[in-house]
C-alpha cells in the first residue's frame, strides 16, 4: 500500500516494520541450552529496530506476524558426531516467556551435516521472548556469516 | 598477554595416573574452548582433548577415550588433564592450547610444554 | 578420521629462496577448515595461517597459504633465517581434529 507523505517521514518503528538481526555472543554455562545473542552496529552487521534484547534472548515490542529465521553452524562438529559419537544435536526456536505462551515454533535436527537453517510465519506479541536451545555437545560457530537468528515483522 | 603454563609432568610408571594442570593469564578464560595436544619424542602432533569454554561439552580422541579426563575451574583461570592408566605410548610433550575465539579448533596461542614420561 | 599427508618431509632450501609445502586430505576438509603451524626446536608450536589462506595475527606476508577441499599449500616467498623450521598442517573441520607429520625446511 502507499504511504502517505506524513507517513513516510516517521521512523520504521512507528509503522511497525519492527526487524532484528542477531550474532552468537556465547553458549549458556552448564546445564543451560540456550544460546546467547547480541545486536549493534558497533558488533558488524547485527542490529535491533524494535525488537530488544533481554539477558541475551530477543524480545519482541509489536504484535503481528513475523518472519523468524535462524542459521546455525556447528564448529566443532564430525561427519559422524552427530549421530554416532554424541547425542544427537539439535536446534529449537521457541517463545520461553510468558509462560503462559511458551510454545516450539521451530525444531532442526543436525543430522549428518554441521550447518542447519531455516524460518518461518509465526504470530508473536508484545512480550514475547524467544529463546534458542541448542542441545548435545557440539559448539556453535560465533563466526558472524555462518550463526545468525532474526525477526522481520511482516503485517499486523 | 595470552600466558598458558603447564605442570604437572613427570615420570611415571605404567598404569599409574598423573594429572596435568594449565595455568592461564591475559584473557577471558571461560569464554575460550581449551584442548591438550601432545608431541612424542621425535613424531607428529596428536590432538588429545578438548572442552568447552563453560566445561558443559568435552571430546577425547579414541586412543584415550575413557582414560584421561579434561576439566577446568573458570575461578581459577586453569585448565585440567587426568591421566589414568597410563601406557608407554602416552610417553609426550603435552601441551595446553587456546581456540580461536569463534569455537575453532585451531589454536592461536599454546603453552611451552609439560613432559610426561611412562616408564618402567 | 581426516589423514593428512605433508610433503616433502624435508626441504633444503637457502635463504632468499620460495618454499612450497604441500598438505594433501584423505577426504575432503570442511570449508577449508585447515591451519598451518611453525615450530621450532624446544618450542611450542606458533599459528600461521587458519582457514587455509588468513594469515594469524603478526605473521608477515610472506607466508601465504591456498588451497580448498583435499589439497592445500603453505608458501614462503622469501625465506629467512628464522623461518628454518617444522611445519604442521591441522584440519579442525571434522573431529577428530588431525595434523600431518611436518615439513622440515632447512638451511641448504
Known amino acids: 500500500q502507499r504511504l502517505s507523505r506524513a507517513q513516510q517521514q516517521l521512523p520504521l518503528e512507528s509503522l511497525g516494520w519492527d526487524i532484528a538481526e542477531l550474532q552468537l555472543n556465547h553458549t549458556g554455562p552448564q546445564q543451560d541450552p540456550r544460546l546467547y545473542w547480541q545486536g549493534g552496529p558497533a558488533l558488524g552487521r547485527s542490529f535491533l529496530r524494535g525488537p530488544e534484547l533481554d539477558k541475551g534472548q530477543l524480545r519482541i515490542r509489536r504484535d503481528g506476524i513475523y518472519m523468524v529465521h535462524i542459521q546455525v553452524t556447528l564448529a566443532i562438529c564430525s561427519s559422524t558426531s552427530t549421530s554416532r559419537h554424541h547425542h544427537p544435536t539439535t536446534l529449537a526456536v521457541g517463545i520461553c516467556s510468558p509462560a503462559s505462551r511458551s510454545i516450539s515454533l521451530l525444531r532442526l535436527s543436525f543430522h549428518q551435516g554441521c550447518t542447519i537453517a531455516s524460518q518461518r510465519l509465526t504470530p508473536l506479541a508484545r512480550g514475547d521472548t524467544l529463546c534458542t536451545n541448542l542441545t548435545g555437545t557440539l559448539l556453535p560457530s560465533r563466526n558472524t556469516d555462518e550463526t545468525f537468528f532474526g525477526v522481520q515483522w511482516v503485517r499486523p | 598477554e595470552v600466558q598458558l603454563l603447564e605442570s604437572g609432568g613427570g615420570l611415571v610408571q605404567p598404569g599409574g595416573s598423573l594429572r596435568l594442570s594449565c595455568a592461564a593469564s591475559g584473557f577471558t578464560f571461560s569464554v575460550y574452548a581449551m584442548s591438550w595436544v601432545r608431541q612424542a619424542p621425535g613424531k607428529c602432533l596428536e590432538w588429545v582433548s578438548t572442552i568447552s569454554g563453560s566445561g558443559g561439552s568435552t571430546f577425547y580422541a579414541e586412543s584415550v577415550k575413557g582414560r584421561f579426563t579434561i576439566s577446568r575451574d573458570n575461578s581459577k583461570n586453569t585448565l585440567y588433564l587426568q591421566m589414568n592408566r597410563l601406557r608407554a605410548e602416552d610417553t609426550a610433550v603435552y601441551y595446553c592450547?587456546?581456540?580461536?575465539?569463534?569455537?575453532?579448533?585451531?589454536?592461536?596461542?599454546w603453552g611451552q610444554g609439560t613432559l610426561v614420561t611412562v616408564s618402567s | 578420521e581426516i589423514v593428512l599427508t605433508q610433503s616433502p618431509g624435508t626441504l633444503s632450501l637457502s635463504p632468499g629462496e620460495r618454499a612450497t609445502l604441500s598438505c594433501r586430505a584423505s577426504q575432503s576438509v570442511r570449508s577449508s577448515y585447515l591451519a598451518w603451524y611453525q615450530q621450532k626446536p624446544g618450542q611450542a608450536p606458533r599459528l600461521l595461517i587458519y582457514g587455509a589462506s588468513s594469515r594469524a595475527t603478526g605473521i608477515p606476508d610472506r607466508f601465504s597459504g591456498s588451497g580448498s577441499g583435499t589439497d592445500f599449500t603453505l608458501t614462503i616467498s622469501r625465506l629467512e633465517p628464522e623461518d628454518f623450521a617444522v611445519y604442521y598442517c591441522q584440519q579442525y573441520g571434522d573431529l577428530p581434529f588431525t595434523f600431518g607429520c611436518g615439513t622440515k625446511v632447512e638451511i641448504k
Open positions: 592450547a587456546r581456540h580461536d575465539y569463534s569455537n575453532y579448533a585451531y589454536f592461536d596461542y
